[in-house]
Interface confidence: medium
C-alpha cells in the first residue's frame, strides 16, 4: 500500500511530503490516491480535512505546501487515501521536518605548516544555503563538517559548529582531501544533505619553506 | 509587478540543441514552480517541464523525457529549457509559465497564473 | 497520464449568446482544473481555478463547475472580446495535460 515516505521543509517557510506509489503484484487495484490535511487552530483539530492544495510542484507522488499554506506554530496531521479508504497517516509539526538544503561556496585557505612541513592546519569555510533566513533569525543552523584522504572511505567528523568557517589541523601533505559539510536547523528537524564536495590538495614541503638567496 | 520573458528561440537544424531562458521578475523563482508549455503552429497547448527549486524536483512530458533538461538559477530569477536531440516536431513557441497555489490555506490547487510571451523555436533542415 | 478530453472542439456563438464547453477527464482529478482564454499570438490567460474559483480581474460572465470527472466553463453573456480558444487543464499530478481546446467563433 502507498506509505509516506518523507515531509521535508528547506527553510521553514514551505513543506513538501512524498509517498510510495508502488502496485505490488497480487494486490487490489487501488484508486487514484489523494492526500488531505487537517491542521489544529489552539487546543482542537478542525474535523474539516483538505485536500493537497499543489500536486505539482514537488514532483510526482507529492503535495506541496507553499509559504501561504506552511505555518511553523501549527500542527499538521496529513493522510493518504484512495478509493475513500484512508492508507497512510502521520502528524508533525513543521519545525519538526526541517532538512536544509546543503551549504554553498566552499573553500579554503593555508593556515599554518608544522615545522617538520609533513603538517599542515587549514581554515575551511562557506555560505548557509541561499534560502534560509539567517540574518533575520528566522533560522539558526549548525554545521557539521567531515573530512577524508581522497583514496580513504571513512569519514571523519567534526563536531557540530553554529559558525560558517572552522580550522582542520594536522593534515598530511602530499595527500588530497575530501571536505563536506551538511546543516540543521538548531534544536530540531535533520540534517540536510550534504554540500558539494571540496578538494583540498596541500602543496608540496618546498613550497611551504622560504628559499634563502645565497650570493 | 509579476513578468516572465523568454528568450534563446531561433532555427535549428534536427538533432541540434538550444538552451531557452525564462527570466522572472516581481517573484522568487526558488518559492514558485516554473514550467514549460508550447504550442506548434496552429496546434494546442502542451506541457513540457516543471521545475520546483525549494523541493528540488523537476518533471518532464513523455514526448521529451531524456532529450529535454529543465533547471533554475536562483541566485539569476531565471529559469532555463536545454533542448537536445531537437526533432522536427519539436518546432513550437515555447511559454514559460508560474504555477500558483493560492493563499487560503483551505482553498487547494493552484494554477499557471503568469506567462511569459512565448519564443520561436524552429526545428528544420 | 491523465487525459483531458473537451468538447466541442469549436463552436459558433453571437453576442450575448450563453456558451458552455466541457472537459472530462480520464479519472480522478478532485477539483485540480483551470481554464484558460487565449488569442491568436498571444500567451493564454487564466481565468478560472480549481474548477470553479474566478481568477482576479476576469469578469464575473466566466464562471466553473464539476461534476464529478466533468468539469464546465460557462460565459454566461458572450461579448466581443470573448472570441477566442479555451483550453482546460489538470493538475492533480506532476504531470499537467491539457484539453485539445475550443475556439468560439462569431456566428
Known amino acids: 500500500e502507498p506509505k509516506f515516505t518523507k515531509c521535508r521543509s528547506p527553510e521553514r517557510e514551505t513543506f513538501s511530503c512524498h509517498w510510495t506509489d508502488e502496485v505490488h503484484h497480487g494486490t487490489k487495484n487501488l484508486g487514484p490516491i489523494q492526500l488531505f490535511y487537517t491542521r489544529r487552530n489552539t487546543q482542537e483539530w478542525t474535523q474539516e480535512w483538505k485536500e493537497c492544495p499543489d500536486y505539482v510542484s514537488a514532483g510526482e507522488n507529492s503535495c506541496y505546501f507553499n509559504s501561504s499554506f506552511t505555518s511553523i506554530w501549527i500542527p499538521y496531521c496529513i493522510k493518504l487515501t484512495s478509493n475513500g479508504g484512508t492508507v497512510d497517516e502521520k502528524c508533525f509539526s513543521v519545525d519538526e521536518i526541517v532538512q536544509p538544503d546543503p551549504p554553498i561556496a566552499l573553500n579554503w585557505t593555508l593556515l599554518n605548516v608544522s615545522l617538520t612541513g609533513i603538517h599542515a592546519d587549514i581554515q575551511v569555510r562557506w555560505e548557509a544555503p541561499r534560502n534560509a533566513d539567517i540574518q533575520k533569525g528566522w533560522m539558526v543552523l549548525e554545521y557539521e563538517l567531515q573530512y577524508k584522504e581522497v583514496n580513504e572511505t571513512k569519514w571523519k567528523m567534526m563536531d557540530p559548529i553554529l559558525t560558517t568557517s572552522v580550522p582542520v589541523y594536522s593534515l598530511k601533505v602530499d595527500k588530497e582531501y575530501e571536505v563536506r559539510v551538511r546543516s540543521k536547523q538548531r534544536n530540531s528537524g535533520n540534517y540536510g544533505e550534504f554540500s558539494e564536495v571540496l578538494y583540498v590538495t596541500l602543496p608540496q614541503m618546498s613550497q611551504f619553506t622560504c628559499e634563502e638567496d645565497f650570493y | 509587478e509579476v513578468q516572465l520573458v523568454e528568450s534563446g528561440g531561433g532555427l535549428v537544424q534536427p538533432g541540434g540543441s538550444l538552451r531557452l531562458s525564462c527570466a522572472a521578475s516581481?517573484?522568487?523563482?526558488?518559492?514558485?514552480?516554473i514550467h514549460w508549455v508550447r504550442q506548434a503552429p496552429g496546434k494546442g497547448l502542451e506541457w513540457v517541464a516543471s521545475?520546483?527549486?525549494?523541493?528540488?524536483?523537476?518533471s518532464y512530458a513523455d514526448s521529451v523525457k531524456g532529450r529535454f533538461t529543465i533547471s533554475a538559477d536562483t541566485s539569476k530569477n531565471t529559469a532555463y529549457l536545454q533542448m537536445n536531440s531537437l526533432r522536427a516536431e519539436d518546432t513550437a513557441v515555447y511559454y514559460c509559465?508560474?504555477?500558483?497555489?493560492?493563499?487560503?490555506?483551505?482553498?487547494?490547487?493552484?494554477?499557471?497564473?503568469?506567462w511569459g510571451q512565448g519564443t520561436l523555436v524552429t526545428v528544420s533542415s | 497520464d491523465i487525459q483531458m478530453t473537451q468538447s466541442p472542439s469549436s463552436l459558433s456563438a453571437s453576442v450575448g449568446d450563453r456558451v458552455t464547453i466541457t472537459c472530462r477527464a480520464s479519472q480522478s482529478v478532485s477539483s485540480a482544473v483551470a481554464w484558460y482564454q487565449q488569442k491568436p499570438g498571444k500567451a493564454p490567460k487564466l481565468l478560472i481555478y480549481?474548477?470553479?474559483s474566478l481568477y482576479s480581474g476576469v469578469p464575473s460572465r466566466f464562471s466553473g463547475s464539476r461534476s464529478g470527472t466533468d468539469f464546465t466553463l460557462t460565459i454566461s453573456s458572450l461579448q466581443p472580446e470573448d472570441f477566442a480558444t479555451y483550453y482546460c487543464q489538470q493538475s492533480s499530478s506532476s504531470l499537467i495535460t491539457f484539453g485539445q481546446g475550443t475556439k468560439v467563433e462569431i456566428k
Open positions: 521545475i520546483s527549486s525549494s523541493s528540488g524536483s523537476t
Open positions: 480549481s474548477a470553479s
Open positions: 509559465a508560474r504555477y500558483n497555489s493560492w493563499g487560503i490555506w483551505w482553498r487547494p490547487f493552484g494554477a499557471l497564473d503568469y
Open positions: 516581481g517573484f522568487n523563482v526558488y518559492y514558485s514552480s
